[in-house]
Interface confidence: medium
């Protein structure tokens, strides 16, 4: 309720501003607050042109309706003229806004509400969650009139959300018994013959399911790629393309690799054989470093347990890094920094796989909303850090790029789905107790660990709160940090967010009742999300930090793609282009 | 070679303050978390205070941390211990020490021959 | 705090003999534990760091065992070189703490 002051400063006001004209130290006098009298005044001087009669300045005042060029607009419409909902002033996803709550506090840029902060001639606009659009103004009422400020338009291929065509018309099992004669890739170019030279030299070393038949050029999945039929292309040798068809969504069982949908007891003490480890990549392309994967110098080869992983451990049995800690030395030794040359910065995480090869996640490099699309020559990965910002001489190793390999059906339109790159080395790094590759999941230990509630760990550079300025506490981490999060039930997941979460995606973090916070945060992207397993004592890379909303919100958790899932596209790239060198003139 | 030497230890009253030095040479300094460990006459060893490589992070042993200030500077390989408000209890022998992997680990790897700190009236 | 128990706290040994040396910490420090050596007058030697590494230089007659709270610094055959106190240090949890320390004298 308003106290007596309020009310005798509201009359106040209305007396000296509202039934005459007032100047700003007359609305000081009667605000008694600067900060108050500020956005008072925004609103006041935006009503210049409606001071009579004085219902029209009162409606006016208020905002819910837009006088001129609507720079008094104080509603809450969030959505565009053509229906694209508005993003929020303070993110920074998926665009970077020039305009803010600090360039521009008394416009008073709340949630996602349209605002007109730079007097633009159309009206109230915001900036939008489309990628492909960064700003679009709103239809907002015209004060006193039966109009509004431009007209809605909405976009006509509807909803952005993909809807589900009948079962009848879509693709079962990934198209592992496709027999259509689809022969283009998603990108439009020819497929090969799988019969031509190129080809069959390429399909040599490939486990292939003798079932299915490679006729003439068309678009086949004949090693269970998740991602679905595909075919070689003219090119670069060994380039393929993926071909688009419309696949069924089908539940995700054990097969897809996690048991994120049902509710799942399989308990992990139940399984008490160590398995071995088997490599899965050919070493000739792979380069060295699978067979001791996952095994830490300072760690596991020392019979060492890090500080934190028994808490891993023990959720199998029964934190940018926000609410993080400083990590170990070694503790993650596969982490790498992502570096660009000019200017030097700390663009993200990534992890190293083997010793030529290094994950990231693809909008690390290709985010066309924020004019980001590095090349080979833009980059650098700084491996067996744990400082982030000095130079730790005969610790740390510099590599050159030779290439980088974006997924080619990563989605950065719409929702960062298949958010994964490759980047391989110029020369392979040396392994030492600082650096050392990650194991990557077979399905086996994809389906046991990728589990509701079962820990995985987050370590990385990034920023230790969601907004931060260089004079109030601690922004950015002398030191890697390391946070550790349960995995969350994929329906939970989905529920958190308007974004649509696709199955190359799995989230985590702590939900608002469970009393421990953490989350991944900007300049975490890239990086592993990496789980223990208690059957061989190895580390594997089960995610990588894609994206959230915020940092460490309640009921918001961080997304990551599924690394697993997209195993046969890592794999693909590797075996095709491991051996090839590229050299740039 | 690698070797760490300290300096400042002497006679002080109680209530009186000194600065300890330990110059590092034979390996790079500014790589290494260090530390100082004290050792009171016939007794064991007592750990006092360590420091991360570039000096942004500091840990005391709690009864200390009011009175004793770690520090370092990189481009002179010094590492110093500020000792105020000193009692009896604080004579002991001061020894500097590099850790053993370039980072968190707390193990000593390497130390210096000590120097003497008598608190006495 | 963690404490650390050493025992016993001086024992007397000859050439050749083998000696074992417990360290017992109040709560578990997952192999966190360093043991070292010092002679009078002179500055601790680290011998055995992660429970069970020896340091570079070290003889093997040195050897570190143990899990969870309960540790052992076993020397297989007493050397002249070896009479000395040696301690033990745990650096699982601040503060780092060492054990009593644990006097081999010539008997």
């Known amino acids: 309720a308003n106290t007596f002051l309020e009310e005798v400063r509201k009359g106040n006001l209305e007396r000296e501003c509202v039934e005459e004209t007032c100047s700003y130290e007359e609305a000081f006098e009667a605000l008694e607050s600067s900060t108050a009298t500020d956005v008072f005044w925004a609103k006041y001087t935006a009503c210049e042109t409606a001071r009579t009669p004085r219902d029209k300045l009162a409606a006016c005042l208020e905002g819910n309706c837009a006088e001129g060029l609507g720079t008094n607009y104080r509603g809450h419409v969030n959505i565009t003229r053509s229906g694209i909902e508005c993003q929020l002033w303070r993110s920074r996803y998926p665009h970077k806004p020039e305009i803010n709550s600090t360039t521009h506090p008394g416009a008073d840029l709340q949630e996602n509400f349209c605002r007109n902060p730079d007097s633009s001639t159309t009206g109230p606009w915001c900036y939008t969650t489309d990628p492909t659009v960064r700003r679009q103004e709103c239809s907002i009422p015209v004060c006193g009139q039966d109009q509004v400020t431009v007209a809605m338009t909405p976009r006509s291929e509807g909803s952005s959300v993909n809807l589900s065509p009948p079962l009848e018309q879509c693709v079962p099992d990934r198209g592992q018994q496709y027999q259509g004669r689809l022969a283009v890739t998603t990108h439009g170019l020819p497929c090969l013959a799988w019969a031509s030279a190129q080809a069959k030299a390429l399909s040599k070393h490939q486990d292939f399911n003798s079932a299915v038949q490679l006729v003439e050029n068309f678009c086949r999945n004949p090693d269970g790629d998740e991602e679905g039929v595909w075919c070689y292309v003219a090119g670069k040798p060994g380039d393929f393309g993926y071909c688009d068809l419309n696949y069924c969504e089908e539940a995700v069982e054990e097969e897809t690799g996690d048991g994120l949908d049902e509710d799942s007891d399989r308990a992990i003490e139940g399984r008490t054989a160590t398995s071995e480890y088997q490599t899965f990549f050919n070493p000739r392309t792979f380069g060295s470093g699978e067979a001791d994967c996952g095994l830490r110098p300072l760690f596991e080869k020392k019979s060492l347990e890090d500080k934190t992983e028994r808490e891993l451990l023990e959720s199998y049995i029964d934190g940018r890094i926000v609410e993080g800690s400083d990590a170990e030395i070694g503790m993650s030794p596969w982490q790498v920094m992502l570096f660009r040359k000019s200017p030097q910065e700390l663009l993200c995480g990534a992890s190293l796989i083997s010793d030529r090869w290094v994950l990231t996640a693809a909008h690390c490099l290709l985010y066309p909303p924020w004019d980001k699309n590095f090349t080979e020559n833009d980059l650098l990965v700084r491996i067996g850090k744990h400082s982030r910002t000095r130079y730790e001489r005969n610790i740390e190793k510099i590599s050159m790029l030779e290439k980088i390999y974006i997924h080619p059906r990563y989605n950065w339109r719409e929702n960062l789905d298949r958010d994964i790159a490759l980047m391989k080395l110029k020369k392979p790094v040396a392994f030492s107790d600082y650096i050392h590759p990650v194991c990557l999941p077979d399905r086996e230990t994809a389906a046991s660990l990728l589990q509701a509630g079962y820990k995985g760990r987050v370590t990385g550079w990034g920023n230790l709160k969601e907004t931060w300025t260089a004079n109030v506490g601690k922004g950015q981490p002398s030191v890697l940090q390391v946070v550790n999060l349960p995995i969350v039930e994929r329906p939970v997941c989905k529920d958190s967010t308007r974004i649509r979460i696709t199955d190359n995606m799995f989230c985590a973090g702590y939900k608002p009742d469970e009393g421990k916070r953490g989350d991944a945060c900007e300049g975490d992207s890239g990086g592993p999300f990496v789980m223990k397993s208690p059957f061989n004592n190895r580390w594997y890379q089960m995610g990588i930090v894609s994206w959230g909303e915020g940092c460490d919100r309640d009921g918001k958790y961080g997304f990551y793609t599924h690394v697993f899932r997209l195993k046969k596209w890592i794999q693909k790239v590797i075996d095709q282009f491991g051996e090839h060198h590229h050299h740039h003139h | 070679e690698v070797q760490l030497v300290e300096s400042g230890g002497g006679l002080v009253q109680p209530g009186g303050s000194l600065r300890l030095s330990c110059a590092a040479s034979?390996?790079?300094?500014?790589?290494?978390?260090m530390a100082w460990v004290r050792q009171a006459p016939g007794k064991g060893l007592e750990w006092v205070s360590n420091?991360?490589?570039?000096?942004?992070?500091?840990y005391y042993l709690d009864s200390l941390k009011s009175r004793f200030t770690i520090s370092r500077d990189n481009s002179k390989n010094t590492l110093y211990l500020q000792m105020n408000s000193l009692k009896a209890e604080d004579t002991a022998v001061y020894y500097c020490a590099r850790d053993h992997y370039m980072g968190n680990s707390y193990v000593f790897d390497t130390w210096g021959q000590g120097t003497t700190v008598t608190v006495s009236s | 705090d963690i404490q650390m128990t050493q025992s016993p706290s001086s024992l007397s040994a000859s050439v050749g003999d083998r000696v074992t040396i417990t360290c017992k910490a109040s709560?578990?420090?997952?192999?966190?534990l360093a043991w070292y050596q010092q002679k009078p007058g002179k500055a601790p030697r680290l011998i055995i760091s992660g429970a069970t590494s020896l340091e570079t230089g070290v003889p093997s007659r040195f050897s570190g065992s143990g899990s969870g709270k309960d540790y052992t610094l076993t020397i297989s055959s007493l050397q002249p070189e070896d009479f000395a106190t040696y301690y033990c240090q745990q650096y699982w949890s601040t503060p780092w703490t060492f054990g009593g320390g644990t006097k081999v004298e010539i008997k």
């Open positions: 034979g390996f790079t300094f500014s790589d290494y978390y």
């Open positions: 420091i991360n490589s570039d000096g942004s992070s500091t």
């Open positions: 709560e578990d420090i997952y192999n966190r």
